[in-house]
């Protein structure tokens, strides 16, 4: 292997090393080996256990276990404390593997049965017959026959003619092996002479035969050329006769025969004879000439090699003449004699002139196969024929060993080049590559010269190792007073506030960012911006809201700032925008009664009239409650009542009877006499006088208000219409008095009837 | 779970006998091959015979054959060792071991002392 500039014989990142004689090898990384690292190192991840030594196989990238001493198998996974080292259980010959730690399996040689293969197949006589399979089971077999067959080896066929209907339609049982046919009456066919029978249909012509029926249960086959029987059923055989030639075998075929021939003849009638020397042209073996003959083949071997294929190496040793106590090596078509120390020559007849040892400096000693005198090889810097003298390399005639120009100094055995400026190496050849030492900076790339070097620079960079770097600010690009930054190969310009680009040549509208908030107008200036702020804003981007809170407008409320704006939200009791207007919550006339209303702060109090109380004044005391109209009907009132006399009863409580007579109805002397709400008149004796009206019809003055009169001769009745009462039907029956609207319900008395008003959440005629 | 119960250990006479038995429970006595091992004061494991799962096939330590006996009873899951012609090299800590000796389940032992 020879590591050469340009040319890396190493893969997978391995290291080309020379050696000083001047061949290489490949150092491979972790994980590589082989001669050029090709082979990734099949050790690298170690699969030996229990401390097994894993080895690399170099050639094939292949590994094997090298295992401790307790310890076996591929991986050395496998204790040889295991069963199948220690007990040995696999009999007759069987093989034991190893499934685990514990257990095993045995594999049995043919003829052996069982889980140590410990039984004798008994299945291996076949004994089991009609096609029927034979298991072991300890020593003993156990067949399981086919239909048809039965007995302990199912030799024995079942007559299924025995057992009646098989066959339908009168058809004869015939018994067959392991089965049996129906042989049917004309007319009927199947199986089981269950079809009725029509000749061709279908056709019981085969191999291609044509069906004609020739009558109602007859038919005729016409067969295929090579094909006979009735119906066609017979290859006829067309081997007699054949012509097949040196051995070969007729094998009859449809209409004709093929000729099977043995493997030295070929063609239609074996005549023809097989060229082995080219179909195969390894016949012969070892170098071996194939000579083609009819009917077979021959080998010529070459020397040495024997055999109908020259396979065979002859033994020369079995001829040979080695002297006693040498080691004869058999090899093709000669034999060499391995020679005891001491002893030399091609049979070892000759003493070893090698072993006092005659050869100087190093050098290697053979003896004379022919004679016995030694020959010495020497190294190199040395001559003579026992290598004493100093070979002088600098006044070799030829030329000088020293390259570019090197001075050749003479040593003992050897020689050195001193070298000029530039080259290095044994011999001067080789030019000192001055970029080895990467002299070149930034990314300079390294030029090797004579002696040298030169660096090309990068851009932005200059000197002899590109060094330096180009200072671009020294032109001053930046412009609107920008401070310039040098970088590698550029520069980079710092722009003063409100300029930009990439030598702040731009003038930056700072308005363009809509740095003014809510609804300002924003106004460029050459270095910032400024923000003309809308109605309620301060601030520089006028994001402020100008608090209309500060000072507190709302007098009795909170006040909650909006854009220039402010809500007051007043507290109970309180109204108006800056919550200064007290409210009067007598405005409603929410007291009852003529009770009297004094506005309080979100409130109000009512001072009820006597007789009243709530707080509404919407409780009215009961003045009827201690019935003080005697003959009349109570009016409830505030703090005071009314009554509403009977017919013929007057004054405050309706207790006095009002004296009818006083008015002198009755004419003519009669005797008046006062009654309850009426009188009578006593006429005198004698005829009626009209003025003496003692029968006075009393309806005729339409006493009842709201109701029919009855009755008037001697007092009256009214029958009052519906919701009205009293005696003159002059009083609005209250329905409202057996409080008939539910769930907290208002009921306002109407005639002949009231009307509820409920309360929120409730509705229907009595707020039920 | 596997468990190995050794007995039949004691003292006994040079010359004399002794028969060590193994129940086994908690794994298909069947299936594998056993083992018995013994451990002599201050010494290290040592083998001392083994038989096959099927108890067709039995091998034993050069120290014990033609004196001891191993056999056993996959029916009554029992692994048996019978030992005649003890002597005082014999004394040891009896185990009976499935499978692998070195690396297989072991019982707790039983101590056979041979001693005049």
């Known amino acids: 292997l020879q590591c050469r500039d340009g040319y890396e014989p190493c893969v997978n990142e391995g290291m080309c090393v020379t050696y000083h004689n001047g061949t290489g090898y490949c150092k491979c990384p972790e994980g590589f080996l082989g001669e050029y690292c090709q082979h990734r190192d099949p050790c690298e991840k170690n699969r030996c256990q229990n401390g097994g030594t894993c080895v690399a196989q170099a050639m094939l990238g292949k590994a094997t276990c090298r295992c401790a001493s307790g310890f076996t198998g591929e991986d050395c996974q496998y204790s040889t404390s295991h069963p199948c080292f220690v007990s040995r259980p696999c009999l007759n010959g069987g093989t034991c593997h190893m499934l685990s730690r514990d257990t095993y399996e045995c594999t049995c040689q043919v003829g052996f049965t069982g889980k140590e293969c410990q039984w004798t197949d008994a299945c291996l006589s076949h004994p089991c017959a009609n096609g029927s399979t034979c298991t072991t089971v300890a020593n003993q077999f156990s067949c399981k026959c086919l239909t048809g067959f039965t007995g302990q080896k199912c030799e024995t066929d079942v007559n299924e003619c025995d057992i009646p209907g098989h066959c339908q339609h009168g058809g004869t049982c015939l018994n067959l092996p392991g089965s049996y046919q129906c042989q049917c009456p004309q007319g009927f066919t199947g199986q089981y002479c269950d079809s009725l029978y029509v000749p061709c249909a279908p056709s019981p012509c085969v191999n291609g035969g044509t069906c004609r029926q020739t009558g109602d249960f007859t038919f005729e086959c016409n067969c295929l050329p090579g094909f006979e029987g009735s119906t066609c059923e017979r290859n006829i055989d067309d081997c007699p006769n054949h012509r097949c030639q040196n051995g070969g075998v007729c094998v009859d075929g449809v209409n004709t025969y093929n000729c099977r021939c043995p493997p030295q003849w070929t063609g239609q009638f074996c005549t023809e004879d097989v060229d082995e020397c080219l179909l195969q042209p390894n016949a012969c073996q070892n170098g071996g000439t194939c000579a083609n003959r009819n009917g077979g083949y021959g080998c010529v071997c070459v020397n040495g090699w024997s055999g109908d294929d020259c396979s065979e190496n002859i033994d020369d040793c079995a001829f040979a003449s080695c002297t006693p106590g040498s080691t004869c090596i058999d090899r093709v078509a000669s034999f060499s004699c391995m020679c005891p120390e001491g002893k030399a020559g091609l049979l070892c007849h000759l003493d070893d002139a090698c072993i006092s040892n005659p050869c100087h400096k190093g050098a290697l000693c053979d003896t004379n196969p022919l004679n016995g005198q030694y020959i010495c090889t020497c190294p190199q810097g040395y001559k003579g024929a026992d290598c004493t003298e100093d070979v002088d390399e600098c006044a070799m005639a030829n030329s000088n060993p020293c390259e570019h120009a090197g001075k050749c100094v003479n040593t003992d055995g050897a020689f050195h080049c001193e070298c000029l400026k530039g080259y290095a190496g044994p011999r001067c050849e080789m030019d000192i590559n001055e970029c080895h030492s990467d002299p070149c900076q930034n990314d300079a790339t390294c030029l090797d010269k004579i002696g040298g070097f030169t660096c090309l620079c990068m851009p932005g960079f200059k000197g002899v190792h590109c060094e330096l770097e180009i200072n671009e600010c020294q032109s001053n690009p930046c412009v609107n007073n920008g401070q310039c930054v040098d970088k590698v190969n550029r520069f980079q310009c710092l722009c003063p506030p409100g300029f930009t680009g990439p030598v702040c040549q731009i003038d930056i509208d700072d308005c363009s960012s809509t740095p003014c908030l809510n609804g300002a107008k924003c106004i460029d200036h050459p270095n910032g911006y400024e923000c003309q702020c809308a109605t309620g804003f301060t601030g520089v981007l006028c994001e402020e809201n100008i608090d209309n809170c500060d000072p507190d407008p709302c007098h009795h409320g909170q006040c909650q700032d909006g854009i220039d704006s402010y809500t007051c939200i007043c507290n109970p009791g309180y109204m108006g925008a800056i919550c200064s207007d007290q409210i009067d919550e007598c405005y409603s006339s929410p007291c009852l009664n003529d009770g009297r209303c004094i506005d309080l702060v979100n409130g109000y109090q009512c001072n009820c009239q006597p007789g009243t109380s709530g707080v509404n004044c919407e409780i009215n005391f009961d003045d009827c409650a201690s019935n003080p109209c005697i003959h009349g009907i109570c009016m409830d009132g505030i703090n005071r009542y009314s009554c509403v006399c009977s017919p013929g009863f007057t004054g405050q409580r309706c207790n006095i009877d009002i004296d009818e007579c006083a008015s002198n109805p009755c004419r003519k002397g009669a005797t008046c006499i006062n009654g309850v709400n009426g009188f009578r008149c006593i006429c005198p004796e004698g005829p009626h006088h009209p003025s003496c009206y003692s029968q006075v019809n009393e309806c005729l003055s339409n006493p009842c208000i709201h109701g029919n009169c009855t009755g008037g001769l001697s007092g009256y009745k009214c029958l009052c219409d519906a919701g009205w009462v009293g005696i003159n039907c002059e009083v609005d029956k209250n329905e409202c008095l057996s409080n008939p609207c539910q769930n907290g319900g208002t009921c306002d008395n109407l005639v002949n009837g009231y009307r509820c008003t409920c309360k929120k959440g409730f509705k229907g005629y009595n707020c039920q | 779970e596997v468990q190995l119960v050794e007995s039949g250990g004691g003292l006994v006479q040079p010359g004399g006998s002794l028969r060590l038995s193994c129940a086994a429970s908690?794994?298909?006595?069947?299936?594998?091959?056993m083992n018995w091992v013994r451990q002599a004061p201050g010494k290290g494991l040592e083998w001392v015979s083994s038989?096959?799962?099927?108890?067709?096939?039995?091998t034993y330590a050069d120290s014990v054959k033609g004196r001891f006996t191993i056999s056993r009873d996959n029916a009554k899951n029992t692994l048996y060792l019978q030992m005649n012609s003890l002597n005082p090299e014999d004394t040891a800590v009896y185990y009976c071991?499935?499978?692998?000796?070195?690396?297989?389940?072991r019982g707790q032992g039983t101590q056979v002392t041979v001693s005049s």
């Open positions: 038989i096959s799962a099927g108890g067709y096939s039995t």
């Open positions: 071991a499935r499978g692998d000796w070195r690396y297989g389940s």
């Open positions: 908690g794994f298909t006595f069947g299936d594998y091959a």
